[in-house]
Amino acid sequence: MKVLQEPTCVSDYMSISTCEWKMNGPTNCSTELRLLYQLVFLLSEAHTCIPENNGRAGCVCHLLMDDVVSADNYTLDLWAGQQLLWKGSFKPSEHVKPRAPGNLTVHTNVSDTLLLTWSNPYPPDNYLYNHLTYAVNIWSENDPADFRIYNVTYLEPSLRIAASTLKSGISYRARVRAWAQCYNTTWSEWSPSTKWHNSYREPFEQH
Protein backbone atom coordinates (compact mmCIF):
# COMPACT_ATOMS: atom_id res chain seq x y z
CA MET A 1 0.00 0.00 0.00
CA LYS A 2 1.48 3.32 -1.11
CA VAL A 3 0.51 6.96 -1.34
CA LEU A 4 0.16 8.01 -4.97
CA GLN A 5 -0.62 11.69 -4.35
CA GLU A 6 0.55 13.12 -1.04
CA PRO A 7 -1.96 14.81 1.25
CA THR A 8 -2.76 18.43 0.50
CA CYS A 9 -4.66 20.39 3.11
CA VAL A 10 -6.67 23.61 3.29
CA SER A 11 -7.95 25.41 6.37
CA ASP A 12 -11.07 27.51 6.87
CA TYR A 13 -8.94 29.55 9.30
CA MET A 14 -11.40 28.88 12.05
CA SER A 15 -12.21 25.34 13.09
CA ILE A 16 -11.62 22.80 10.36
CA SER A 17 -8.92 21.77 7.90
CA THR A 18 -9.52 19.31 5.09
CA CYS A 19 -6.80 17.03 3.76
CA GLU A 20 -7.09 14.95 0.59
CA TRP A 21 -4.80 12.35 -0.94
CA LYS A 22 -4.77 9.41 -3.32
CA MET A 23 -3.60 5.87 -2.79
CA ASN A 24 -2.07 3.64 -5.44
CA GLY A 25 -5.11 1.39 -5.61
CA PRO A 26 -8.65 0.87 -4.30
CA THR A 27 -8.66 1.59 -0.57
CA ASN A 28 -11.21 1.47 2.21
CA CYS A 29 -9.92 4.67 3.78
CA SER A 30 -11.87 4.44 7.06
CA THR A 31 -10.78 0.91 7.92
CA GLU A 32 -7.24 0.87 6.51
CA LEU A 33 -5.85 4.35 7.23
CA ARG A 34 -5.47 6.88 10.02
CA LEU A 35 -4.17 10.44 9.81
CA LEU A 36 -2.56 11.64 13.03
CA TYR A 37 -2.11 15.38 13.52
CA GLN A 38 -0.47 17.34 16.28
CA LEU A 39 0.11 21.02 16.92
CA VAL A 40 3.83 21.69 17.15
CA PHE A 41 4.46 22.87 20.70
CA LEU A 42 5.39 21.30 24.00
CA LEU A 43 2.74 19.05 25.60
CA SER A 44 0.33 19.18 22.67
CA GLU A 45 -1.90 16.16 22.11
CA ALA A 46 -1.96 13.95 19.05
CA HIS A 47 -5.37 13.73 17.39
CA THR A 48 -6.57 10.94 15.13
CA CYS A 49 -8.65 11.52 12.03
CA ILE A 50 -10.55 8.63 10.44
CA PRO A 51 -10.55 9.32 6.70
CA GLU A 52 -13.52 8.92 4.39
CA ASN A 53 -13.47 7.67 0.83
CA ASN A 54 -13.44 10.18 -1.97
CA GLY A 55 -13.54 8.01 -5.07
CA ARG A 56 -12.03 4.50 -5.33
CA ALA A 57 -8.49 5.44 -4.38
CA GLY A 58 -9.04 8.88 -2.86
CA CYS A 59 -9.30 9.72 0.82
CA VAL A 60 -10.37 12.84 2.67
CA CYS A 61 -9.94 13.76 6.33
CA HIS A 62 -11.51 16.62 8.26
CA LEU A 63 -9.18 17.82 11.01
CA LEU A 64 -10.88 19.63 13.87
CA MET A 65 -8.84 22.55 15.10
CA ASP A 66 -9.19 25.18 17.76
CA ASP A 67 -9.21 28.84 16.68
CA VAL A 68 -6.36 29.12 14.19
CA VAL A 69 -3.53 31.59 14.76
CA SER A 70 -0.89 32.40 12.17
CA ALA A 71 1.89 30.67 14.10
CA ASP A 72 0.10 27.30 14.24
CA ASN A 73 1.97 24.45 12.58
CA TYR A 74 0.88 20.80 12.57
CA THR A 75 2.73 17.58 11.98
CA LEU A 76 0.83 15.03 9.91
CA ASP A 77 1.45 11.27 9.94
CA LEU A 78 -0.47 8.94 7.66
CA TRP A 79 -0.59 5.38 8.99
CA ALA A 80 -1.77 2.07 7.60
CA GLY A 81 -1.85 -0.09 10.72
CA GLN A 82 1.72 -0.01 12.06
CA GLN A 83 3.18 1.24 8.78
CA LEU A 84 3.97 4.93 8.39
CA LEU A 85 3.08 5.76 4.80
CA TRP A 86 3.80 9.48 4.79
CA LYS A 87 4.98 12.22 7.11
CA GLY A 88 4.54 15.93 6.54
CA SER A 89 3.55 19.24 8.05
CA PHE A 90 0.81 21.78 7.54
CA LYS A 91 0.59 25.45 8.45
CA PRO A 92 -3.11 26.42 8.26
CA SER A 93 -2.43 30.13 7.75
CA GLU A 94 -0.52 29.36 4.54
CA HIS A 95 -3.25 27.23 2.98
CA VAL A 96 -6.55 28.99 3.54
CA LYS A 97 -9.82 28.31 1.77
CA PRO A 98 -12.41 30.62 3.33
CA ARG A 99 -15.84 29.51 4.40
CA ALA A 100 -18.56 30.19 1.88
CA PRO A 101 -20.73 33.27 2.44
CA GLY A 102 -24.31 32.61 3.53
CA ASN A 103 -27.81 34.06 3.52
CA LEU A 104 -27.66 35.46 0.00
CA THR A 105 -30.78 37.56 -0.53
CA VAL A 106 -31.95 39.55 -3.53
CA HIS A 107 -34.00 42.63 -2.64
CA THR A 108 -36.11 43.65 -5.62
CA ASN A 109 -38.28 46.31 -4.00
CA VAL A 110 -35.83 49.18 -4.46
CA SER A 111 -36.89 51.20 -7.51
CA ASP A 112 -35.38 49.48 -10.51
CA THR A 113 -32.29 48.57 -8.50
CA LEU A 114 -31.32 45.08 -7.40
CA LEU A 115 -29.72 44.89 -3.98
CA LEU A 116 -27.91 41.64 -3.23
CA THR A 117 -26.83 41.06 0.35
CA TRP A 118 -25.12 38.13 2.05
CA SER A 119 -23.47 37.33 5.36
CA ASN A 120 -19.78 37.32 6.14
CA PRO A 121 -19.06 33.71 7.17
CA TYR A 122 -16.68 34.69 10.00
CA PRO A 123 -17.29 36.14 13.46
CA PRO A 124 -15.96 39.66 14.02
CA ASP A 125 -12.93 38.54 16.03
CA ASN A 126 -11.61 36.31 13.24
CA TYR A 127 -8.79 37.83 11.22
CA LEU A 128 -10.52 37.08 7.92
CA TYR A 129 -13.68 38.95 8.91
CA ASN A 130 -12.27 42.29 7.75
CA HIS A 131 -10.26 40.92 4.84
CA LEU A 132 -12.77 39.14 2.63
CA THR A 133 -13.68 40.31 -0.83
CA TYR A 134 -16.30 38.64 -2.97
CA ALA A 135 -17.34 37.58 -6.44
CA VAL A 136 -21.03 37.50 -7.30
CA ASN A 137 -22.14 35.28 -10.17
CA ILE A 138 -25.49 36.06 -11.81
CA TRP A 139 -26.90 33.94 -14.60
CA SER A 140 -30.10 33.45 -16.53
CA GLU A 141 -31.96 30.18 -16.19
CA ASN A 142 -33.18 30.59 -19.77
CA ASP A 143 -29.99 31.63 -21.53
CA PRO A 144 -26.68 29.94 -20.62
CA ALA A 145 -24.79 32.72 -22.41
CA ASP A 146 -26.25 35.30 -20.03
CA PHE A 147 -23.65 34.70 -17.32
CA ARG A 148 -21.79 37.44 -15.49
CA ILE A 149 -19.39 37.95 -12.59
CA TYR A 150 -19.28 41.06 -10.42
CA ASN A 151 -16.18 41.59 -8.28
CA VAL A 152 -16.94 43.14 -4.91
CA THR A 153 -13.63 44.55 -3.73
CA TYR A 154 -15.00 46.56 -0.80
CA LEU A 155 -15.71 44.96 2.58
CA GLU A 156 -19.47 45.43 2.74
CA PRO A 157 -21.22 42.15 1.81
CA SER A 158 -23.60 43.69 -0.70
CA LEU A 159 -23.92 44.56 -4.36
CA ARG A 160 -26.22 47.04 -6.11
CA ILE A 161 -26.94 46.77 -9.79
CA ALA A 162 -29.52 48.36 -12.04
CA ALA A 163 -32.28 45.90 -12.84
CA SER A 164 -32.09 47.11 -16.42
CA THR A 165 -28.63 45.59 -16.84
CA LEU A 166 -30.44 42.25 -16.85
CA LYS A 167 -33.23 41.17 -19.15
CA SER A 168 -36.74 41.84 -17.96
CA GLY A 169 -39.39 39.18 -17.54
CA ILE A 170 -37.07 36.22 -16.95
CA SER A 171 -35.68 34.37 -13.94
CA TYR A 172 -32.13 34.80 -12.73
CA ARG A 173 -30.01 33.05 -10.16
CA ALA A 174 -27.14 34.44 -8.08
CA ARG A 175 -24.43 32.98 -5.91
CA VAL A 176 -21.43 34.45 -4.12
CA ARG A 177 -17.97 33.30 -3.05
CA ALA A 178 -15.15 34.85 -1.03
CA TRP A 179 -11.39 35.13 -0.87
CA ALA A 180 -8.83 37.04 1.17
CA GLN A 181 -5.89 38.64 -0.58
CA CYS A 182 -3.93 39.07 2.65
CA TYR A 183 -3.47 35.31 3.01
CA ASN A 184 -3.44 34.65 -0.73
CA THR A 185 -6.30 32.24 -0.15
CA THR A 186 -8.08 30.12 -2.70
CA TRP A 187 -11.69 31.00 -3.45
CA SER A 188 -14.32 29.62 -1.13
CA GLU A 189 -17.01 27.33 -2.43
CA TRP A 190 -19.97 29.11 -3.92
CA SER A 191 -22.84 29.90 -1.60
CA PRO A 192 -26.17 28.21 -2.28
CA SER A 193 -27.84 30.07 -5.14
CA THR A 194 -30.96 32.17 -4.85
CA LYS A 195 -33.54 32.81 -7.55
CA TRP A 196 -35.65 35.82 -8.48
CA HIS A 197 -37.81 37.03 -11.33
CA ASN A 198 -36.33 40.14 -12.90
CA SER A 199 -38.83 42.78 -13.93
CA TYR A 200 -38.54 46.52 -14.23
CA ARG A 201 -40.40 49.39 -15.87
CA GLU A 202 -39.15 50.07 -19.36
CA PRO A 203 -38.40 53.79 -19.80
CA PHE A 204 -41.20 55.60 -21.69
CA GLU A 205 -40.06 56.30 -25.23
CA GLN A 206 -41.21 59.54 -26.88
CA HIS A 207 -41.59 59.66 -30.68
Partner: antibody, heavy 115, light 107 residues
Framework: QVQLVESGGGLVQPGGSLRLSCVAS????????MNWVRQAPGKGLEWVSY????????YYADSVKGRFTISRDNAKNSLYLQMNSLRDEDTAVYYC????????WGQGTLVTVSS | DIQMTQSPSAMSASVGDRVTITCRAS??????LAWFQQKPGKVPTRLIY???SLQSGVPSRFSGSGSGTEFTLTISSLQPEDFATYYC?????????FGQGTKVEIK
Protein backbone atom coordinates in the same frame (compact mmCIF):
# COMPACT_ATOMS: atom_id res chain seq x y z
CA GLN B 1 -5.14 12.83 30.71
CA VAL B 2 -7.45 15.77 30.06
CA GLN B 3 -9.56 16.74 33.07
CA LEU B 4 -12.06 19.54 33.62
CA VAL B 5 -13.52 20.06 37.09
CA GLU B 6 -16.33 22.54 37.71
CA SER B 7 -17.27 24.07 41.05
CA GLY B 8 -19.22 26.95 42.49
CA GLY B 9 -22.76 25.69 41.96
CA GLY B 10 -25.42 25.82 44.62
CA LEU B 11 -28.76 27.24 45.64
CA VAL B 12 -29.36 30.93 44.97
CA GLN B 13 -32.41 33.18 45.05
CA PRO B 14 -33.80 34.82 41.89
CA GLY B 15 -31.87 38.01 41.21
CA GLY B 16 -28.80 36.66 42.97
CA SER B 17 -25.30 35.94 41.68
CA LEU B 18 -22.93 32.98 41.46
CA ARG B 19 -19.45 32.48 40.07
CA LEU B 20 -18.65 29.11 38.53
CA SER B 21 -15.09 27.86 38.10
CA CYS B 22 -13.59 25.18 35.89
CA VAL B 23 -10.06 23.99 36.59
CA ALA B 24 -8.26 22.29 33.72
CA SER B 25 -5.43 19.79 33.78
CA UNK B 26 -3.70 17.37 31.43
CA UNK B 27 -3.37 19.84 28.56
CA UNK B 28 -2.04 23.32 27.85
CA UNK B 29 -5.02 25.40 28.92
CA UNK B 30 -3.77 28.64 27.36
CA UNK B 31 -3.81 26.97 23.94
CA UNK B 32 -7.47 25.99 24.19
CA UNK B 33 -10.66 27.93 23.59
CA MET B 34 -13.37 27.02 26.08
CA ASN B 35 -17.15 26.91 26.46
CA TRP B 36 -19.89 26.71 29.04
CA VAL B 37 -22.87 24.47 28.21
CA ARG B 38 -25.86 23.90 30.47
CA GLN B 39 -28.65 21.36 30.86
CA ALA B 40 -31.84 22.06 32.79
CA PRO B 41 -33.20 19.07 34.74
CA GLY B 42 -34.76 16.60 32.31
CA LYS B 43 -34.12 18.92 29.36
CA GLY B 44 -31.70 19.18 26.45
CA LEU B 45 -28.29 20.77 26.06
CA GLU B 46 -27.92 24.54 25.67
CA TRP B 47 -24.71 26.27 24.70
CA VAL B 48 -24.10 29.25 26.99
CA SER B 49 -20.80 30.95 26.20
CA TYR B 50 -17.41 30.71 24.47
CA UNK B 51 -14.00 32.34 24.97
CA UNK B 52 -11.29 32.23 22.31
CA UNK B 53 -7.73 31.15 22.99
CA UNK B 54 -6.51 33.25 20.07
CA UNK B 55 -8.16 36.64 20.59
CA UNK B 56 -9.95 36.40 23.93
CA UNK B 57 -13.19 37.14 22.06
CA UNK B 58 -16.34 36.06 23.86
CA TYR B 59 -19.77 34.99 22.66
CA TYR B 60 -23.00 34.36 24.55
CA ALA B 61 -26.36 32.75 24.03
CA ASP B 62 -29.14 35.34 23.74
CA SER B 63 -30.74 33.95 26.91
CA VAL B 64 -27.77 35.00 29.09
CA LYS B 65 -26.38 38.03 27.23
CA GLY B 66 -25.89 40.98 29.56
CA ARG B 67 -26.20 38.83 32.69
CA PHE B 68 -23.38 36.29 32.38
CA THR B 69 -19.67 36.95 31.85
CA ILE B 70 -17.13 34.34 30.75
CA SER B 71 -13.46 34.84 31.62
CA ARG B 72 -10.27 32.88 32.05
CA ASP B 73 -7.02 32.95 34.01
CA ASN B 74 -4.38 31.04 32.09
CA ALA B 75 -1.91 31.24 34.97
CA LYS B 76 -4.40 29.31 37.12
CA ASN B 77 -5.61 27.01 34.31
CA SER B 78 -9.09 28.25 35.15
CA LEU B 79 -12.26 29.20 33.32
CA TYR B 80 -15.00 31.23 35.00
CA LEU B 81 -18.64 32.09 34.52
CA GLN B 82 -19.94 35.06 36.50
CA MET B 83 -23.74 34.78 36.63
CA ASN B 84 -25.77 37.81 37.72
CA SER B 85 -29.51 38.55 37.84
CA LEU B 86 -30.21 34.84 38.01
CA ARG B 87 -33.65 33.57 37.03
CA ASP B 88 -35.59 30.39 37.71
CA GLU B 89 -34.90 29.26 34.13
CA ASP B 90 -31.12 29.37 34.76
CA THR B 91 -31.49 26.28 36.96
CA ALA B 92 -29.32 23.65 35.31
CA VAL B 93 -26.17 21.57 35.44
CA TYR B 94 -23.37 23.74 34.03
CA TYR B 95 -20.56 22.03 32.12
CA CYS B 96 -17.31 23.48 30.89
CA UNK B 97 -16.27 21.99 27.56
CA UNK B 98 -13.09 22.34 25.56
CA UNK B 99 -12.63 23.24 21.93
CA UNK B 100 -12.57 22.11 19.26
CA UNK B 101 -16.30 21.43 19.28
CA UNK B 102 -16.64 20.16 22.85
CA UNK B 103 -14.07 17.37 22.67
CA UNK B 104 -13.83 17.11 26.47
CA TRP B 105 -16.43 17.92 29.13
CA GLY B 106 -16.32 18.33 32.87
CA GLN B 107 -18.75 16.45 35.12
CA GLY B 108 -20.82 19.56 35.72
CA THR B 109 -21.96 21.64 38.69
CA LEU B 110 -25.62 22.11 39.62
CA VAL B 111 -27.03 25.63 39.89
CA THR B 112 -30.49 25.91 41.47
CA VAL B 113 -32.31 29.24 41.32
CA SER B 114 -35.28 29.22 43.63
CA SER B 115 -36.93 31.29 46.31
CA ASP C 1 -29.89 32.71 15.11
CA ILE C 2 -29.82 29.27 13.55
CA GLN C 3 -32.49 26.86 14.81
CA MET C 4 -31.81 23.13 14.83
CA THR C 5 -34.85 20.85 14.62
CA GLN C 6 -34.38 17.18 15.43
CA SER C 7 -36.81 14.39 14.65
CA PRO C 8 -38.14 12.27 16.10
CA SER C 9 -38.00 13.59 19.66
CA ALA C 10 -38.26 10.01 20.94
CA MET C 11 -38.36 6.55 19.43
CA SER C 12 -38.52 2.91 20.48
CA ALA C 13 -36.27 0.39 18.79
CA SER C 14 -34.93 -3.12 19.27
CA VAL C 15 -31.38 -4.42 19.39
CA GLY C 16 -30.23 -4.97 15.81
CA ASP C 17 -32.52 -2.32 14.33
CA ARG C 18 -31.30 0.32 11.93
CA VAL C 19 -32.00 3.71 13.49
CA THR C 20 -32.08 7.05 11.69
CA ILE C 21 -32.28 10.45 13.35
CA THR C 22 -32.57 13.64 11.34
CA CYS C 23 -31.59 17.21 12.07
CA ARG C 24 -32.69 20.23 10.06
CA ALA C 25 -30.98 23.63 10.21
CA SER C 26 -32.99 26.81 9.65
CA UNK C 27 -30.29 28.03 7.25
CA UNK C 28 -27.31 26.61 5.41
CA UNK C 29 -24.55 25.46 7.78
CA UNK C 30 -22.41 23.63 5.19
CA UNK C 31 -20.94 20.65 7.08
CA UNK C 32 -20.45 22.39 10.43
CA LEU C 33 -22.55 19.86 12.30
CA ALA C 34 -21.72 17.42 15.09
CA TRP C 35 -23.65 14.62 16.81
CA PHE C 36 -23.41 13.83 20.53
CA GLN C 37 -24.59 10.90 22.61
CA GLN C 38 -25.66 11.30 26.24
CA LYS C 39 -26.52 8.45 28.57
CA PRO C 40 -28.56 9.09 31.75
CA GLY C 41 -26.45 10.73 34.44
CA LYS C 42 -23.43 10.94 32.14
CA VAL C 43 -21.61 13.65 30.23
CA PRO C 44 -22.22 13.98 26.46
CA THR C 45 -19.65 12.46 24.10
CA ARG C 46 -19.03 13.43 20.50
CA LEU C 47 -19.79 10.76 17.89
CA ILE C 48 -19.59 12.61 14.58
CA TYR C 49 -18.18 15.95 13.48
CA UNK C 50 -18.09 17.78 10.14
CA UNK C 51 -21.44 16.08 9.37
CA UNK C 52 -19.89 12.74 8.41
CA SER C 53 -16.51 12.31 10.12
CA LEU C 54 -16.46 9.54 12.71
CA GLN C 55 -14.84 10.48 15.99
CA SER C 56 -11.85 8.26 16.76
CA GLY C 57 -12.84 5.46 19.12
CA VAL C 58 -16.53 5.52 18.13
CA PRO C 59 -17.89 2.24 16.67
CA SER C 60 -18.29 2.20 12.89
CA ARG C 61 -22.01 1.36 13.21
CA PHE C 62 -22.46 5.11 13.73
CA SER C 63 -22.44 7.23 10.60
CA GLY C 64 -23.45 10.73 9.64
CA SER C 65 -24.46 12.30 6.37
CA GLY C 66 -25.84 15.51 4.93
CA SER C 67 -24.79 19.03 4.08
CA GLY C 68 -26.44 22.43 4.01
CA THR C 69 -29.65 22.12 6.01
CA GLU C 70 -30.48 18.39 6.17
CA PHE C 71 -28.45 15.94 8.25
CA THR C 72 -28.81 12.35 9.35
CA LEU C 73 -27.30 10.20 12.08
CA THR C 74 -27.59 6.47 11.40
CA ILE C 75 -26.94 3.55 13.72
CA SER C 76 -26.68 0.57 11.39
CA SER C 77 -27.37 -2.10 14.01
CA LEU C 78 -28.51 -0.86 17.40
CA GLN C 79 -26.63 -2.30 20.37
CA PRO C 80 -27.76 -2.37 24.03
CA GLU C 81 -25.26 0.36 24.93
CA ASP C 82 -26.69 2.69 22.26
CA PHE C 83 -29.92 3.40 24.15
CA ALA C 84 -29.38 7.07 24.98
CA THR C 85 -30.29 10.61 23.93
CA TYR C 86 -28.70 12.03 20.79
CA TYR C 87 -28.15 15.70 20.04
CA CYS C 88 -27.05 17.54 16.91
CA UNK C 89 -25.05 20.75 17.21
CA UNK C 90 -24.30 23.44 14.65
CA UNK C 91 -21.05 25.33 15.01
CA UNK C 92 -21.27 27.27 11.76
CA UNK C 93 -21.93 30.51 13.64
CA UNK C 94 -22.57 31.99 17.07
CA UNK C 95 -24.67 31.41 19.01
CA UNK C 96 -24.01 27.71 18.68
CA UNK C 97 -27.22 25.74 18.87
CA PHE C 98 -28.19 22.17 19.74
CA GLY C 99 -31.16 20.25 18.50
CA GLN C 100 -33.71 19.42 21.18
CA GLY C 101 -32.55 15.80 21.38
CA THR C 102 -33.79 12.37 20.34
CA LYS C 103 -34.29 9.75 23.03
CA VAL C 104 -33.77 6.20 21.77
CA GLU C 105 -35.57 3.77 24.08
CA ILE C 106 -35.86 -0.02 24.20
CA LYS C 107 -38.97 -1.37 22.48
Amino acid sequence: QVQLVESGGGLVQPGGSLRLSCVASGFTFSHSSMNWVRQAPGKGLEWVSYISRATGAVYYADSVKGRFTISRDNAKNSLYLQMNSLRDEDTAVYYCAREPVFDYWGQGTLVTVSS
Amino acid sequence: DIQMTQSPSAMSASVGDRVTITCRASQDISNYLAWFQQKPGKVPTRLIYAASSLQSGVPSRFSGSGSGTEFTLTISSLQPEDFATYYCLQWSSYPRTFGQGTKVEIK
